[in-house]
Each structure stands twice: as C-alpha cells, then as structure tokens.
Interface confidence: low
C-alpha cells in the first residue's frame, strides 16, 4: 500500500467546491492510483462527492451532510472532512486507499503527450465498437449487434456507460461488450465520414458528453453476418484473459487477483458484472471489466 | 433538494385521454431517466415505461405499448406521459419516478427509484 | 399478478420485530440483480426505504435492513413504531421482461 502524501487539515489542497463531476472525471481520469478530490455534490446540495482515480477509472463516492453536522460516507461517520480523508489513507475504498490530491490545475494523464493544440469537440467524443449482441434487459438499455460503432455520452458507472448510436438512440451499455476506437489519423474532422478512421483499441482519456442526438459517422467494413452473442457457461466453462491488474482487499476472501495476461477460466456470469472464475486452481469473483473474453471464432484476435 | 412535483387529480370518461405532468427540480433535468409506474386500487405497483430527457427516447411496458405516449419539454424541464383510450380498470395512483444514483461505496447494479413524485390520481367513470 | 410475491399482510406490537418476504425466480432475483424496498403510504410519495439487497439511504433509521439469498429476499423491521404502518413493495428486475422493472405484491403492515 502506497503511502499518503497530503495534509488532511489543509482543506485548500483537496477540497475543489463546486466542481461538476464531469470535470472531476477529466482531472482524475488516467491519474496515478490514489489520487482524489472532494467537491460539492451537484445533485444533493450540501452533500459532498470523493472522487477518485483507482484501478484505471475514476470512482465517485457521496459523503452525506447529516443533521448532526457529521458526514457519512457507505456506513462510515465521521466529525469532519479531514478525519474521513484520515479515514482512507489507511482504509481501501474499492481499491485504493487516498494518496494524494490532484493539482487544481489538471495534468495531462499519466503515459499521454499534451497536445500541441486542443481538439475540435468532434474529435473529441469517444467512441467504442461493440464485440458482441447485446439485447438490452433493462428499459435503460441500449440494445445493440456486433460491429456497432457507438459514441460514448458518460461514464456514470464503472460497468455501464452511456452511448448513442447511429439511430440517435441513447442508452446504458456493459462496458466489457465493447472496445474502445481512437481516431488513426486526428488531423481534419472533415474527412471521408465513410471511410473507417479508426484505430484498435487505445485509451481515450477525454469525452464530451453532449446531448445533441447527431448521428454517428457511418463506418464501412462492420461485420454484418456474423452476429456473436456473448458466450454461455452453461455449455461449460469460457476462457477470458485478464486486461487489468486486479489486487483485492485483504479481508475479501471471495476475491480473486488478476494479474494481466492471467488466463481466466470463467464458470460463471452474474448479471451483476461480478463473474466466477479460476486462475491456476484459485477460485474466485472478479469484475467482468477486468477480462476479455477469448472469441472462438477469431482464434487471431485473442492474441 | 430533489423533487419531482405531478399534476393534479384528474376524472375522465372510458374512452377519453389524460395527460400528466411531471415537473423535476433540484438536479440537471437531462441526468436522470423518468419512469412512470401506477398503483390501482387494492393492486400492486405497476411499471408503464421511461423516458430519457435527454435524447427523448422511450420505452413502454408491452401492456401500454399503443396507449402511451411520453414526452418532454425541455424549455420548461417538464415530462408527460398520455394514455389513451381510458377503461375503468385504469384508475389508478400515477407516479412518476426518478431512477438515480444513490451513490454510496456500494456498487448498485441497477439503480433504485430515489425520488418519486407525490401521485396523481386518475378516476376513469361513466 | 405480480413478478415477485410478498405476503398480503404482516402485524406486530410496538416494539416488536416483523419481517417481509419476497420472493422471485431465477430471471430476476436469483439472476443476481439487486433487491430495493419503498414504503408508501397512501396519498404521499413513495419512500426508498433500502437499495442493494441490504443499504440503507441516509436519513432510513437502522431499525430497518434488508438481506438477499438465491431467489428471495427479506425485510426486517425492528423496534416497531406506529408511523411503520404502511405498504412495503419489494423492486427488482426481470431479465426475461423487456421492461425488466418488477415489483412485488405489496405487503401491509399493520402495528398492533
């Protein structure tokens, strides 16, 4: 566990006031593990939101201003502010504990090179194609077939994100149904709105979150015909490598670690994203963020 | 704070149309998908459909599809939701409700109805 | 007839304990989604009363909790108080319906 490097009691450093989450979001995304910041709720005034960059996303927890002028956050309480931070430089939230304030004037994400000029709102909406049908089981939903291009609108949750389609259509999708596309060649938004500018599969820090129903540029070469719906344990076990570093809470004793590249043996998918799974005779939950599954019908792609 | 404010009472004849309203104040009008659920008398509740604010796509529960319609304002932050074709077993108390982020440490797979609006009551009668 | 099937009525004394069951299938609850509780009392909005199987919102008194296991989930209402008299709905959802919002019955509750 790293060790936490700020000042609980100088409010100036960690306490950002009326920050939008979209903004936190921007400031944290791609920011070492443990890197935080408290703002003001905009959805529960006098409430208060920590948000913070953990496990390559960025996580936001309520604290809520009680009548006895304490502040709850899950089932903790505490006086004040500056103990729950004391709280969590010791205590995990999911994964991290609190390390470190972000700068008041953001950095650019850990591994990114500042561009040299910022990007036309176009080029800057993130966009994902999606691996597998996804029929929707929620009236939230978004249902979609493989090979769609979607544009992601936010990030409210780390398993569901909102998109649009083609259609204008907004909706939640499950985040491991798809992957995320970078423009190849970012020069111009102008160009051949037909051909397939996009390249395979990158990080893309920065999204707009715009609620214009525009369509989305059409994407030649999208596999039409072979529509894969995302495989079944019930016909045995499915095999899925680890994409992300996955380190538990000591205490959690049905946790399973990832370490990327572990060969996942998955028996079982819940609904509620946490899967069943082996990793060299360790059984275990994991989120199902953490892997990708093997396609058996590209044997190429799995590489 | 969050509250989502309803239209009032409304009596109509079988065969008649009714349209509520749903005014949400205290949050970004566009950030939160609303429902609309009823509750008949002596009867559980009963889910009708959602609209999103924001893009203004709907969805209804197969047993309202072709009687529903919900709709927004988005210069006045209001929601409607019209059901046509009105029979006595449609009265009922209608909510709207607002399917939000409770936000705790907890990761809520599907989230919870956190706010509802007060109810208007609909009486369908000859 | 509703997706989830609670009990029509339960009944307890001041201060005693009562709780509420609900039960569901292997397309709703049993399909791990989460299990939410409101109260609601006649002519008032309906209240959250528990979200995610077992949390309580800030402000429910901890007189209440919820617990999930397989494809039933309960209520627990410790200490009953007189202003508990209401309707309790159980709320998951339905991976087989495609509005996918189901509630239960209802279950009145009475205080002695």
């Known amino acids: 566990m790293s060790s936490a490097r700020f000042d609980s009691s100088d409010r100036s450093a960690w306490y950002m006031g009326p920050v939008s989450r979209q903004e936190a979001q921007t400031r944290l995304q791609g920011q070492r593990h443990g890197m935080f910041l408290v703002r003001d709720s905009s959805t529960c005034p006098g409430d208060y939101v920590l948000s913070v960059s953990e496990n390559s996303r960025v996580s936001h927890y309520i604290i809520n201003s009680l009548p006895n002028r304490r502040f709850k956050i899950g089932d903790q309480e505490f006086d004040h502010l500056p103990a729950l931070l004391e709280f969590y430089k010791i205590h995990y939230l999911d994964t991290t504990t609190l390390i470190e304030p972000a700068p008041r004037y953001p950095s650019p994400p850990m591994g990114s090179v500042s561009a040299p000029n910022l990007p036309t709102a176009e080029d800057n909406l993130e966009y994902v194609r999606t691996l597998y049908d996804f029929p929707g089981n929620d009236a939230e939903d978004l249902p979609f077939k493989k090979g769609e291009i979607l544009v992601i609108i936010e990030k409210p949750e780390e398993q569901w994100w909102s998109a649009r389609n083609k259609d204008g259509r907004v909706g939640m999708i499950p985040v491991p149904y798809v992957e995320k596309l970078v423009r190849s060649s970012p020069h111009g938004k102008h160009g051949n709105r037909n051909s397939n500018s996009y390249g395979i599969p990158e990080p893309a820090h920065a999204y707009a979150q715009p609620q214009t129903t525009t369509p989305l540029p059409a994407v030649s070469g999208s596999p039409g015909a072979a529509i894969t719906p995302l495989p079944s344990t019930q016909n045995g076990p499915v095999f899925a490598k680890a994409i992300q570093k996955r380190v538990p809470c000591a205490y959690d004793k049905t946790a399973l670690a990832l370490e990327v590249g572990d060969i996942v043996k998955v028996t079982r998918m819940n609904i509620n994203g946490q899967w069943e799974g082996e990793v060299n005779g360790r059984k275990g939950l994991f989120p199902f963020t953490h892997v990708k599954i093997f396609d058996p019908q590209n044997p190429d792609e799995n590489e | 704070q969050v509250q989502l404010v309803q239209s009032g009472a409304e009596v109509k004849k079988p065969g008649a149309s009714v349209k509520l309203s749903c005014k949400p104040s205290?949050?970004?009008?566009?950030?939160?998908?609303i429902h609309w659920l009823r509750q008949a008398p002596g009867q559980g509740l009963e889910w009708m459909g959602i609209i999103n604010p924001s893009g203004g796509y709907t969805s209804s529960a197969q047993k309202f599809q072709g009687r529903v319609t919900m709709t927004r304002d988005t210069s006045t932050s209001t929601i409607y939701m019209e059901l046509s074709s009105l029979r006595a077993e449609d009265t009922a108390v209608y909510y709207c409700?607002?399917?939000?982020?409770?936000?705790?440490?907890?990761?809520?797979?599907?989230?919870?109805?956190?706010?509802w609006g007060q109810g208007t009551l609909v009486t369908v009668s000859s | 007839q509703s997706v989830l099937t609670q009990p029509p009525s339960v009944s307890g004394a001041p201060g005693q304990r009562v709780t509420i069951s609900c039960t569901g299938s292997s397309s709703n609850i049993g399909a791990q989604y989460d299990v939410h509780w409101y109260k609601v009392i006649p002519g008032t909005a309906p209240k959250l009363l528990i979200y995610g199987n077992d949390n309580r919102p800030s402000g429910v008194p901890d007189r209440f909790s919820g617990s999930k296991s397989g494809t039933s989930a309960s209520l627990a209402i410790t200490g009953l108080q007189s202003e508990d008299e209401a309707d309790y709905y159980c709320?998951?959802?339905?991976?087989?319906?495609?509005?996918?919002?189901?509630f239960g019955g209802g279950t009145k509750l009475t205080v002695l």
């Open positions: 709320q998951s959802n339905d991976i087989s319906l495609s509005g996918s919002v189901v």
């Open positions: 205290g949050y970004t009008f566009s950030s939160y998908y």
């Open positions: 409700a607002r399917r939000g982020e409770v936000g705790t440490m907890v990761r809520v797979f599907r989230k919870p109805f956190d706010y």
